[in-house]
Amino acid sequence: LLDVWYLVRLPCAVLRARLLQPRVRDLLAEQRFPGRVLPSDLDLLLHMNNARYLREADFARVAHLTRCGVLGALRQLRAHTVLAASCARHRRSLRLLEPFEVRTRLLGWDDRAFYLEARFVSLRDGFVCALLRFRQHLLGTSPERVVQHLCQRRVEPPELPADLQHWISYNEASSQLLRMESGLSDVTKDQ
């Protein structure tokens, strides 16, 4: 009934990041999270199944936000974060027992969300097998306040890459269309 392995791994990832790994001061620095394709990860073609990419990225993302202090800052600001959007590009399969690394990076932020990237890199040849992007929406505070809390001063956000800007535009257009469909244009807003 419960996904016990998920419920064990997530807090373990947070505790490992908080207690055993050094704090990362540079918010935009890439972080690396190791993994290996297990039999339980496979689909019928003996490749890592698509859902596992999101799941592994979940652990890596939580570890990343812990190590750079964002989750701690959110706790102090009595705020929290939810995943508002994600997209994945699969370039090559990961196979049984293949070692890989999830390389996470904070790409930037706007007035409501942080944007993160997770690259699944095969440790056999360094190939980027999958690229995932995430819009991490903040509730109860703003990204600017979180960054200011961490850096002790106001920090201009980095420029978002052009392809990410297109994805943000797509998400906005999608939100508007769904609101129009529901006839809720002025009533509720997506995250």
């Epitope: 540079d26 935009l28 620095a29 890439e30 790409l107 920090v155 201009e156 956000p157 980095p158 052009a162």
Partner: antibody, heavy 120, light 106 residues
Framework: PVQLQESGPGLVKPSETLSLTCTVS????????WSWLRQPPGRGLEWIGY???????NYSPSLKSRVTISVDTSKNQFSLKLNSVTAADTAVYYC??????????????WGQGTMVTVSS | DIQMTQSPSSLSASVGDRVTITCRAS??????LNWYQQKPGKAPKLLIY???SLQSGVPSRFSGSGSETDFTLTISSLQPEDFATYYC????????FGQGTKVEIK
């Protein structure tokens, strides 16, 4: 190898519009940022702005109100228009290719530059 | 705007000298910093990207270091062809250059 070549008038009158074109040869205009920069005589480098092949632009805050950069993918060209010029806009104008890779955004290929003088 | 402050603005050195140029950003820019070399009448040439990575074809006597706000370009043993002006440039948000450091023959 990819090469960039600026073209346009070398003399522009004050209050008029400066127009330059950069032709990209030896490669496609897709998948890069295409930038304009300038360097007044004896001074440092100043970035003007860039365009992505899809049409996304980003301009220097100090020049934003006067600048338009456009791209013509069919001709492998991108262009600069700078309105209401003054003598302070006299400079060598460079076009450059910028890698759009996060953490590696660099001007890796430059044109040889074209001198533009603003004078009546 | 993010301001880039380079120092010194000029320096005199001899062939074989170790030369260090510093660049300071007005706010954190992670490692989004590049170094260029420019000779009179020529377009700038990329030396170092991402604060410390050497561009291919650039001699290994050039090196870069730093992160967040403070960065350094080092030429370990100055060669005759290295007399030029050097610029740092941030690509964190918009693009801004330092005012340049002119390396002259002593």
């Amino acid at each position: 190898p990819v090469q960039l070549q600026e073209s346009g008038p070398g003399l522009v009158k004050p209050s008029e519009t400066l127009s330059l074109t950069c032709t990209v040869s030896g490669g496609s205009i897709d998948s890069y940022y295409w930038s304009w920069l300038r360097q007044p005589p004896g001074r440092g480098l100043e970035w003007i702005g860039y365009i992505f092949y899809s049409g996304i632009t980003n301009y220097s805050p100090s020049l934003k109100s006067r600048v338009t950069i456009s791209v013509d993918t069919s001709k492998n060209q991108f262009s600069l228009k700078l309105n209401s010029v003054t003598a302070a806009d006299t400079a060598v104008y460079y076009c450059a290719r910028e890698l759009p890779v996060i953490g590696r955004r660099t001007f890796d290929i430059w044109g040889q530059g074209t001198m533009v003088t603003v004078s009546s | 705007d993010i301001q880039m402050t380079q120092s010194p603005s000029s320096l005199s050195a001899s062939v074989g000298d170790r030369v260090t140029i510093t660049c300071r950003a007005s706010q954190t820019i992670s490692t989004y910093l590049n170094w260029y070399q420019q000779k009179p009448g020529k377009a700038p040439k990329l030396l170092i990207y991402a604060a410390s990575s050497l561009q291919s074809g650039v001699p290994s006597r050039f090196s870069g270091s730093g992160s967040e706000t403070d960065f350094t370009l080092t030429i370990s043993s100055l060669q005759p062809e290295d007399f030029a002006t050097y610029y740092c440039q941030q690509s964190y948000n918009a693009r801004t250059f330092g005012q340049g450091t002119k390396v002259e023959i002593k």
